[in-house]
C-alpha cells in the first residue's frame, strides 16, 4: 500500500511568500511624487514580484518628537487621504496583495517611542489597531521595539487585539538587535509574532558562519514560524557586497519562514551608488530618469526597466525565486535539514512528504569550490539522491533542467544552486 499522505499544516497568507516593505513612499515613487494614489499605480509591479504582502509606511501624522501632534488615526495629508488609503486597500485586495500598516509612532523623531510617555503612546497604538483593523488592513508593523519599555507585554496586548479581530491578521515587530537571547525573549511571550531583526546582518563572511546562525536560530525557535531578513528596515546592500546579493536572495526565499524584503532589494538598489541619497531610503530606480541629480550616474542595468528586460538580472532571479517559493509545497512548509558540504559552503534540503524536494547549495567564498555533500548528516527521511536536476543558479548560463551528479558538484565563486529531485519511497 502507498504510504499515507502527511497532513498539511494550517497555512496563513504570510506563510505563502514574501513581504515587501515600502517605508518611504516618496523615495519609492520618486519624481517628487510619493502618495497613496501613486502607490496604487505600482501594485501591478508588486504583483509581478509575486509578493504576498506590502508593509507600508508609517504614513500617519507625526510632528517630530511631539506626542500631542502625533495622530495614528490620521494619514499625513502629504501622503493622501483616508479615501486614497481605502482605494489602495481595495485595489491591493483585488490583486491578492495584503496591506500591513507600520504604526511606529515617532517615525520622524529621535526616539521612535517617545521614551518619556510610553503609556500615552501605548494607548494611542491600541486605539489605532482597532481603528485600522476596522478599516480593513491585514496587519501591523512596529519597529525599534528595543526602545519600547516593557515591549514584551505591550506586544502581547497588541497581538491579542490583532488576533482577536481575526486569526488572519498579522503583527510584525522590528528590532535592531542581533542578539539571539534578546530576540528569543521577545518571541517567548508572543506566539504568533513575526519578528524582523539584524540577526543575520553579520552573516556575510562565510558559509559556515551563516549555517551556524541559521541552524542556531531554527533550533532555538523550535517549530514556530520565522521571518528572514537582514534588518528591520534597511536594504540588503547596506550589509552585503553586490556579489552576495543573489546568494542571499536564494537563501532568504528557501529558508523555512517568511522572507521580508525592502523596496529595491529586488534590483540591488544601493544608496552608496547614488550620491546625496539617504542610506535608509534612497530613491527607487524605475528607469534611468529616476535619479536626475547626476547625469549618467544611473545605467539601465541598475533600474527596474533595464532589469525587467534582462533574464539574467537580479530582478529576474527575484521573480523566479518568489514564484517557486509560493507554489512548491517543500518550500512553502517543508522540513529543513542543513548538512556539511565543505568549507565556505552552506547547504540544506527542504522536503515535504512525497512532494518534490529541493537542495540548496551556497558558496559564500570568492573561489570556486567542489561541494563535498555529506549525506551522512541527514536523517533517512531526507536522504540525498545520486543526481538532482538544476532548477536555477544565481549565476547565468548553467543549463537549467539538466541532471547533475551531486558527487561532482562544483560552484563558482559566490554561486548558489537550487536543485530539485523527486521523492523516493
Amino acid at each position: 500500500r502507498a504510504p499515507r499522505c502527511r497532513e498539511l499544516p494550517a497555512q496563513k497568507w504570510w506563510h505563502t511568500g514574501a513581504l515587501y516593505r515600502i517605508g518611504d513612499l516618496q523615495a519609492f515613487q520618486g519624481h517628487g511624487a510619493g502618495n497613496l494614489a501613486g502607490l496604487k499605480g505600482r501594485l501591478d509591479y508588486l504583483s509581478s514580484l509575486k509578493v504576498k504582502g506590502l508593509v507600508l509606511g508609517p504614513i500617519h501624522k507625526n510632528q517630530k518628537d511631539d506626542v500631542a501632534q502625533t495622530d495614528l488615526l490620521q494619514i499625513d495629508p502629504n501622503f493622501g487621504s483616508k479615501e486614497d488609503f481605502d482605494s489602495l486597500l481595495q485595489s491591493a485586495k483585488k490583486k491578492s496583495i495584503r496591506v500591513i500598516l507600520d504604526l511606529t509612532p515617532n517615525y520622524r523623531g529621535e526616539n521612535s517611542w517617545f521614551s518619556t510617555q510610553v503609556d500615552t503612546v501605548a494607548t494611542k497604538v491600541k486605539d489605532a489597531l482597532e481603528f485600522w483593523l476596522q478599516a480593513g488592513v491585514d496587519g501591523f508593523q512596529v519597529r525599534d521595539i528595543e526602545n519600547l519599555k516593557d515591549a514584551s507585554s505591550f506586544l502581547a496586548e497588541w497581538q491579542n487585539i490583532t488576533k482577536g479581530f481575526s486569526e488572519d491578521r498579522l503583527l510584525i515587530a522590528g528590532t535592531n538587535s542581533s542578539d539571539l537571547q534578546q530576540i528569543l525573549s521577545l518571541l517567548e511571550s508572543n506566539k504568533d509574532l513575526l519578528l524582523t531583526s539584524s540577526y543575520l546582518s553579520d552573516s556575510g563572511s562565510t558559509g559556515e558562519h551563516t549555517k551556524s546562525l541559521v541552524t542556531q536560530y531554527l533550533n532555538a525557535t523550535g517549530n514556530r514560524w520565522c521571518s528572514w531578513s537582514l534588518s528591520q528596515a534597511r536594504l540588503l546592500t547596506s550589509f552585503l557586497p553586490a556579489q552576495l546579493l543573489r546568494l542571499y536572495q536564494l537563501m532568504l526565499f528557501t529558508l523555512p519562514g517568511t522572507p521580508v524584503f525592502s523596496y529595491g532589494d529586488e534590483i540591488g538598489l544601493d544608496a552608496a551608488a547614488l550620491p546625496g541619497q539617504p542610506m535608509e531610503a534612497p530613491v527607487m530606480l524605475w528607469d534611468e530618469s529616476s535619479f536626475p541629480d547626476i547625469p549618467g550616474a544611473v545605467s539601465a542595468n541598475m533600474t527596474v526597466k533595464g532589469q525587467s528586460e534582462d533574464p539574467g538580472s537580479l530582478l529576474s532571479l527575484f521573480r523566479r525565486l518568489s514564484d517557486q517559493r509560493s507554489k512548491e509545497r517543500s518550500l512553502l512548509h517543508g522540513d529543513f535539514h542543513a548538512f556539511s558540504a565543505g568549507p565556505g559552503l552552506f547547504s540544506y534540503i527542504r522536503h515535504w512528504d512525497q512532494n518534490e524536494r529541493f537542495l540548496v547549495v551556497l558558496n559564500f567564498g570568492d573561489v570556486g569550490l567542489s561541494a563535498g555533500l555529506q549525506a551522512s548528516d541527514l536523517p533517512a527521511s531526507a536522504s540525498l539522491p545520486a543526481k538532482a536536476d538544476l532548477l536555477l543558479s544565481t549565476q547565468p548560463g548553467r543549463e537549467e533542467g539538466s541532471p547533475l551528479e551531486l558527487e561532482r558538484l562544483k560552484l563558482e565563486p559566490h554561486e548558489g544552486l537550487l536543485l530539485r529531485f523527486p521523492y523516493a519511497a
Partner: antibody, heavy 124, light 113 residues
Framework: QVQLQQSGPELVRPGVSVKISCKSS????????VHWVRQSRAMSLEWIGI????????DYNQQFKGKATMTVDKSSSTVYMELARLTSEDSAIYFC?????????????????WGQGTSVTVSS | DIVMTQSPSSLAISVGQKVTMSCKSS????????????LAWYQQKPGQSPKLLLY???TRESGVPDRFIGSGSGTDFTLIISSVQAEDLADYFC?????????FGGGTKLEIK
C-alpha cells in the same frame, strides 16, 4: 560514439497531433538532458524546451507551452515530443540535441550533439 | 527573451579569403563573476543538422579547425574564418547560452564564389 537518432518525416493534416522520437546511444543516457529545437524558414532556430532524462522534469520555452509535450522512456533511452493542434506554421524540421559543454560540474546551453532532424509538414 | 541579430544575412567569398560575420545580442552576455561571455557559434551545411563550432565566445569544440576564430564581449560578437575553404559553405548561427530560453540569431549564409 554518441548518436541521437530521430524518427522519420511526417506529413499531417491541420488540427491533428504528431509524436516524434529521439533515441540516444553511445553515452550514459541519464547523465545528460535532451533539448528540442525547431528550424523553420520563417523563424530560424527556436529552442522548444529541455527534458531531464534522469527525473522526467521538463522546462518549456513559454512560446511552446500547450503546443509541445515531452516525455522520456529510460528503458529504451528515448525521448519523445508530441506536437498538438498542428497548423501550417508548425511545418518545420524538429531537432533533438544534447547539451554537453561541461563547466563547473554543470552543462551549458551549447549543444554538442544533434539528431538528424525530423521534418514535419502540415498540409490539407 | 534575449534577441540575437546576425549580419550580413548572406555573403559570397572566394576560397582563401578571410570572412567576418557579426552577431549582436539585446543584452550583455558577460558573466562578470567569471568574465566569460556566453555565446556559441554553429555551422549548418545544406541538408545537415547544426554543428557546434565555438562556445564561451572563443572556445573551440574539439575537431574544429583553428581557422575559425571567435571574439567579442558584452553584446557584440564576431566569427572570423581566417582562410575560407570550399567545405565551409554553410549557414552560420550564433546562440546565447547565457539565460533561459537560449536564443539563436537568424543566420549568415556563406556562399563560395
Amino acid at each position: 560514439q554518441v548518436q541521437l537518432q530521430q524518427s522519420g518525416p511526417e506529413l499531417v493534416r491541420p488540427g491533428v497531433s504528431v509524436k516524434i522520437s529521439c533515441k540516444s546511444s553511445g553515452y550514459a543516457f541519464t547523465d545528460y538532458a535532451v533539448h528540442w529545437v525547431r528550424q523553420s524558414r520563417a523563424m530560424s532556430l527556436e529552442w522548444i524546451g529541455i527534458i531531464s532524462t534522469y527525473s522526467g522534469n521538463i522546462d518549456y520555452n513559454q512560446q511552446f507551452k500547450g503546443k509541445a509535450t515531452m516525455t522520456v522512456d529510460k528503458s529504451s533511452s528515448t525521448v519523445y515530443m508530441e506536437l498538438a493542434r498542428l497548423t501550417s506554421e508548425d511545418s518545420a524540421i524538429y531537432f533533438c540535441a544534447r547539451g554537453g559543454r561541461h563547466y563547473y560540474g554543470s552543462y551549458y546551453y551549447a549543444f554538442d550533439y544533434w539528431g538528424q532532424g525530423t521534418s514535419v509538414t502540415v498540409s490539407s | 527573451d534575449i534577441v540575437m541579430t546576425q549580419s550580413p544575412s548572406s555573403l559570397a567569398i572566394s576560397v582563401g579569403q578571410k570572412v567576418t560575420m557579426s552577431c549582436k545580442s539585446s543584452q550583455s552576455l558577460l558573466n562578470r563573476n567569471n568574465q566569460k561571455n556566453y555565446l556559441a557559434w554553429y555551422q549548418q551545411k545544406p541538408g545537415q543538422s547544426p554543428k557546434l563550432l565555438l562556445y564561451f565566445t572563443s572556445t573551440r569544440e574539439s575537431g574544429v579547425p583553428d581557422r575559425f576564430i571567435g571574439s567579442g564581449s558584452g553584446t557584440d560578437f564576431t566569427l572570423i574564418i581566417s582562410s575560407v575553404q570550399a567545405e565551409d559553405l554553410a549557414d552560420y548561427f550564433c546562440q546565447q547560452h547565457y539565460s533561459t530560453p537560449p536564443t539563436f540569431g537568424g543566420g549568415t549564409k556563406l556562399e563560395i564564389k
